[in-house]
């Protein structure tokens, strides 16, 4: 899917009103140092892009972060505001459904949405340049 | 020009009932979402009611849940809120807003639908006072 239509102030908004506090109450307990920031993204776009993958695309050592609330939320902000989103995500969804299994908080897991915090903090200043 | 007009505000008795309209203008207004805000004195903007007029889908806050009831006329445009049981925790200035991508996505709505920050238009207000 390409980003590029999305509306971005909105889902900048959702993010800052609800899914950053779900991704804080996920990682409560967690030093805020202990994860070095190993993905980075260059624009809005491209930030979308990567927060989608982290967030819906199983890793090893981590199967499934898609079930988590900051997950739901995520997937229905791209829904209301990138124009035609829903209807890629519709093979995509089916085939989780398959493979879904419980959910498991992993050293894993928690490294991954450390990363999504800084995607989401970068997309959020779209205007900085790249360190 | 975008505008959204609030009415049917005033002064009513604990337990009483109100109805507050939303006249809209300027937008299509069938593929909207309209919610109702309250702000009380020294409070922030709380949501109160949804209403997707796209396909009628409506939330509610907690607070007013079985009390208020969200409605819309789409032939005239207009959103409406009826308050009953009202009590003095009711008191505020209420507000219509209206964003154009909640409308026809309420299932997903559910999460976002009463951060005001998301909203693109705004009413100016109309005042409830419940007071014996």
């Known amino acids: 899917y390409d980003f590029t239509n999305c509306d971005f102030e909105k889902i900048k908004a959702a993010y800052l009103s609800t899914i950053s506090k779900d991704l804080i109450t996920y990682m409560s307990g967690t030093k805020s140092t202990e994860f070095n920031n190993t993905v980075s993204c260059s624009n809005r776009p491209h930030c979308l892009t990567e927060i989608q993958s982290l967030t819906f695309n199983p890793t090893a050592g981590c199967a499934s972060l898609a079930k988590e609330m900051f997950a739901m939320k995520t997937k229905a902000a791209l829904a209301i505001w990138c124009p035609g989103y829903s209807e890629t995500q519709i093979n995509a969804t089916q085939a989780m459904k398959k493979r879904r299994k419980r959910k498991v908080t992993t050293n894993k897991c928690l490294e991954q949405v450390s990363q999504l915090q800084g995607l989401w903090r970068r997309f959020n200043r779209p205007l900085l340049k790249q360190q | 020009e975008v505008q959204l007009l609030e009415s049917g505000g005033g002064l009513v008795q604990p337990g009483g009932s109100l109805r507050l309209s939303c006249a809209a203008s300027g937008f299509t207004f069938g593929d909207y979402a309209i919610t109702w805000f309250r702000q009380a004195p020294g409070k922030g903007r709380e949501g109160v009611a949804y209403i997707s007029n796209f396909d009628g889908m409506t939330y509610y806050a907690d607070s007013v849940k079985g009390r208020f009831t969200i409605s819309s006329d789409n032939s005239k445009n207009t959103v409406y809120l009826q308050m009953n049981s009202l009590r003095a925790e009711d008191t505020a200035v209420y507000y219509c807003?209206?964003?154009?991508?909640?409308?026809?996505?309420?299932?997903?709505?559910?999460?976002?639908?009463?951060?005001?920050?998301?909203?693109?238009?705004w009413g100016q207000g109309t005042l409830v006072t419940v007071s014996s």
């Open positions: 807003a209206a964003e154009g991508r909640m409308g026809t996505h309420s299932r997903d709505s559910v999460y976002f639908w009463a951060f005001s920050a998301l909203y693109d238009y």
